[in-house]
């Protein structure tokens, strides 16, 4: 190889200067005695190279780019060779930003997958390869003192969430959890969460059903619906409160909310509705009075209220 480029730093803050030098060895005998070294950034020739002959007879050109405004570009040094440009060497330059502090870290305990799922907002684009790692440890107290550290959780490329499997969790013991972001320009860490996995549990919703009319029970009044719900069995022993929402199927009406309902109400008469009207209903629940996350809304149940009896 006749030429070699070295740079002050191959990765810099976007807009920062960068200095590069290109040396052509003397033993490239097919060259002119004083070849002129040219610089090119991407497709553009760059003026301002300062060239000198070194004591060993090789030629060196040094250039300072005052502002690297490309997030990714190739810098090459070249010679005029006949009517064409002969590239001697090139390097890839990258520019971007250090990672911002990851924001809005939150976690939920999924009892179906037996894992603690944490998600966060990575912040603005850095234009550089940036790795995110979910870090955690067990703590007997309020996370001021660190207990056993838990294996790092590394999300899949481009994802801003990660799952800590059950084998690393103690359901009723505090964990310190934070996200570390790292790239060539720096490292940042989110504020630390301190939580018990069960305090961020997200349950599956109950299954809404229409209540089978029993022979001895009075039929529902006009504008009323008789409902029942089947709790999600794996969460049967968790104290919960629930809420119901309903809206007429036709028209643009918004959801009306009814609650709180105890999970174990199991049977419920919903009144004050329009007679002879088809309604869509859903239910959701949350661990209560202990902390937790609301479940998703249940699949919809569609029911029709009875008509008003003729007067």
């Amino acid at each position: 190889e006749c030429g070699h480029i070295s740079v002050s730093a191959p990765i810099v803050h976007l807009g920062d200067p960068i200095t590069a030098s290109c040396i052509i060895k003397q033993n490239c005998s097919h060259l002119d005695l004083e070849p002129q070294i040219l610089w090119r950034l991407g497709a553009e020739l760059q003026p301002g190279g300062r060239q000198q002959r070194l004591s060993d007879g090789s030629q060196q050109s040094t250039i300072t780019l005052p502002h690297l405004n490309h997030t990714r570009a190739f810098l090459s040094c070249a010679l005029n060779w006949g009517n064409s440009l002969q590239i001697l060497d090139q390097v890839e330059l990258r520019a971007g930003y250090p990672p911002a502090v990851p924001r809005n870290l939150s976690c939920l305990m999924n009892l179906t997958t037996s894992s603690l799922i944490c998600q966060w907002e990575p912040g603005p684009e850095t234009h550089l390869p940036t790795s995110f790692t979910l870090k955690s440890f067990k703590s007997r107290g309020n996370c001021q003192t660190q207990g056993d550290s838990i294996m790092d959780c590394v999300p899949e490329d481009g994802q801003s969430h990660c799952s800590i499997p059950r084998r690393h969790l103690l359901l009723y013991q505090n964990m310190g959890i934070w996200v570390q972001a790292e790239n060539a320009l720096g490292t940042s860490m989110s504020p630390q969460l301190c939580l018990e996995p069960m305090d961020v549990v997200k349950l599956e919703p109950p299954m809404l059903r229409t209540m089978d009319p029993s022979p001895e029970a009075a039929p529902p009044q006009a504008g009323c619906l008789q409902l029942s719900w089947e709790p999600w069995q794996p969460a049967l022993h968790i104290n919960q409160k629930c809420e119901l929402r309903h809206k007429p199927q036709s028209g643009e009406a918004s959801w009306a909310l009814v609650g709180p309902l105890p999970l174990e109400a199991l049977r419920y008469e919903l009144c004050g509705l329009l007679p002879a009207t088809a309604y869509t209903l859903q239910i959701r629940c949350i661990r209560w009075p202990l902390p937790g996350h609301w479940s998703n809304w249940s699949p919809s149940l569609e029911l029709r209220t009875t008509e008003r009896a003729p007067t």
Epitope: L111, S114, H237, P262, A265
Partner: antibody, heavy 118, light 107 residues
């Protein structure tokens, strides 16, 4: 310290009735599911019934459904099991236990022996 | 109903041995598996809940693993006080069901 103390066991004839009680102390009784588990002599454990914190949900094992009734009095911190139409196969030590949020039993009472025999 | 099958039903072991007891569910129960120790004439005592969570006050030589249908209780180094009967229990759905028990006796 959480304590559960069963009482009411004894010898009863087939077809007879018995009411077991479990007095709870050391925790907020009204916040927890409670349950009964039995163990026939030399056999394994068998879940009998559970009751939700306010008493609204009461699942039963098929083997006792329609004969046994679980109930609770949160003002007295006491769990009950009313056993009617008793059979020889109901002979067992009956334990009352607190139910954890994901369905485990802890702690347990010391047990009370129910013997159904003529 | 979910059936729980425990194996072996009995085993002989010596102090210091590593002991493994398995429990199989007739259908998937996620991690809803609990382990108990029972000594003669005494009430059962909870060792492990939710497949791998060690109950407070239980020595760390006890550990649980598995998910779905296959679960294991391991005693890393058997101590004299560990000779007892061990029961598994599923809490995924009612009726709550127990395995038949494993009696760990002195060889």
């Amino acid at each position: 310290e959480v304590q559960l103390l069963e009482s009411g066991g004894g010898l009863v004839q087939p077809g007879g009735s018995l009411r077991l009680s479990c007095a709870a102390s050391g925790f907020t009784f009204s916040l927890y599911w409670m349950g009964w588990v039995r163990q026939a002599p030399g056999k394994g454990l068998e879940w009998v019934s559970s009751i939700s914190s306010s008493g609204g949900v009461t699942p039963y094992a098929d083997s006792v459904k329609g004969r046994f009734t679980i109930s609770r009095d949160n003002s007295k911190n006491t769990l009950y099991l009313q056993m009617n139409s008793l059979r020889a196969e109901d002979t067992a030590v009956y334990y009352c236990a607190m139910l954890g949020e994901l369905g485990w039993f802890d702690p347990w009472g010391q047990g009370t022996l129910v013997t159904v025999s003529s | 109903d979910i059936q729980m099958t425990q194996s072996p039903s009995a085993l002989s072991a010596s102090v210091g041995d590593r002991v493994t007891i398995t429990c199989r569910a007739s259908q998937g129960i996620s991690s809803y598996l609990n382990w108990y120790q029972q000594k003669p004439g005494k009430a059962p005592k909870l060792l492990i809940y939710y497949a791998s969570n060690l109950q407070n006050g239980i020595p760390s030589r006890f550990s649980g693993s598995g998910s779905g249908t296959d679960f294991t209780l391991t005693i890393s180094s058997l101590q004299p006080e560990d000779f007892a009967t061990y029961h598994c229990q599923q809490s995924y759905s009612t009726p709550l069901t127990f395995g038949g028990g494993t009696n760990v006796e002195i060889r």
